[in-house]
């Protein structure tokens, strides 16, 4: 906490500029117009001040907007967001994608702190509904978002904004997730044509039932074993040696390298050996 | 992680010059401010020059007309040019941009001795 003292004279500053970095920390305190400072917010992510100087110019804004700060001023926050704290944060009411950008651009290349989560939050709950543009915002710079949320979180996501997920948006995301993003994509694809159908539903089959699986078994899709890996072992026991082969196609090799390793090794045990040997791959049931 | 790397600090008489360099290793120069600090022992840090992205430079009232800095963006490097220095500007030297100085990420400084 800086003390209250008179501003020296002449050091009143007219403007928000670079030669406020020569400032002690209580000269800032003195002779900074919070007022000002809110207008020109802008410009403060342009000048090198010193993370104690920031403290000086957030403490200004906390006071000067008690019950939280206006958008207005959050959108020109820059580097002084990283001082916010998560309770700061819950006090915003954040609306327009450009801030949500404009803070999330102060934070890129780190990983996703605590006041990065609770932003977001505010932000996605404030819209009622993950929508495409948050989302493609979202998995932009954080690629790994979406598997960050729980599956009460992702049935908010409404199917229109599946077509912004990229593949590796979904590589942390555990069977729960897909089980409820995979309904949501098959919706959103619906109208697609099988090959174009199958690359775009292909990182989500991870929530697949065994009868879409069989669905799929009968377009030549030839999945690869990466994507075989990931289904969820109780859709993929109750398919035939042959429905297998068709789905994965000239992949089907690739099984006795898998093996050992669910969902194959589970599958394997499930199916009668004269219907794995029609394979010719060796797999012992 | 962007690295910033201050050199050209020593031991030098009262009245003597020094020219401190700062090498970053990557392209932050070109879009950004940047500023010299120094810290002297048991003293906060303080700021002593900036120069902005277009080139325009500030001193602090303390250096002013005996310190100049200067930028070369095509070589991510500043310079802190030393002249007339006193016993009192004896401190370690930083140098930093808007991002490095509000995340308190600082390069190892260079010492700079004053003294007969």
């Known amino acids: 906490e800086v003390e209250k003292t008179a501003c020296p004279s002449g050091k009143k500053a007219p403007e928000i500029d670079e030669s406020l970095i020569f400032y002690k920390k209580w000269e800032l305190e003195a002779c900074v117009d919070a007022a000002l400072l809110a207008t020109q917010m802008d410009r403060v992510n342009a000048i090198p001040f010193t993370y104690e100087q920031l403290d000086v110019l957030k403490h200004k804004l906390d006071e000067l907007y008690p019950q939280g700060y206006p958008e207005s001023v959050i959108q020109h926050l820059g580097y002084l967001f990283l001082k916010m704290s998560p309770e700061d944060i819950r006090k915003w009411n954040v609306t327009s994608l450009e801030t949500l950008k404009a803070l999330l651009e102060v934070n890129k290349g780190h990983e996703m702190s605590p006041q990065v989560a609770t932003l977001i939050d505010r932000f996605v709950k404030g819209r009622g509904q993950l929508d495409k543009d948050t989302l493609d915002t979202l998995t932009a710079f954080y690629p790994g978002y979406l598997c960050s949320l729980s599956p009460e979180e992702l049935s908010s996501v409404p199917p229109s904004s599946i077509w912004a997920v990229r593949p590796q948006d979904l590589d942390t995301c555990d069977p729960r997730q897909l089980d409820v993003l995979y309904p949501k994509a098959r919706l959103a694809f619906q109208n697609m044509n099988g090959s174009e159908y199958f690359v775009k539903i292909q990182s989500f089959l991870g929530g697949a039932p065994t009868e879409d699986l069989k669905a799929l078994s009968q377009q030549n899709v030839s999945m690869d074993l990466a994507t075989f890996m990931k289904l969820r072992t109780d859709a993929v026991l109750p398919l035939t040696v042959a429905e297998v082969q068709k789905l994965l196609g000239p992949h089907v090799e690739g099984l006795k390298a898998e093996e050992r390793h669910r969902p194959v090794r589970d599958w394997i045990l499930r199916q009668r050996q004269d219907d794995l040997d029609t394979l010719g791959l060796g797999l012992q049931g | 992680q962007v690295q910033l790397v201050e050199s050209g600090g020593g031991l030098v008489q009262p009245g003597g010059s020094l020219r401190l360099s700062c090498a970053a290793s990557g392209s932050i120069f070109s879009g950004n401010a940047v500023a010299w600090y120094r810290q002297a022992p048991g003293k906060e840090r303080e700021a002593v020059a900036v120069?902005?992205?277009?080139?325009?430079?500030k001193y602090a009232d303390s250096v002013k007309g005996r310190f100049t800095i200067s930028r070369y963006n095509a070589k991510n490097i500043a310079y802190l040019q030393m002249n007339s220095l006193k016993p009192e500007d004896t401190a370690v030297y930083y140098c930093n941009t808007a991002r490095g100085a509000a995340v308190d990420s600082w390069g190892q400084g260079t010492q700079v001795t004053v003294s007969s």
């Open positions: 120069i902005t992205r277009d080139g325009d430079t």
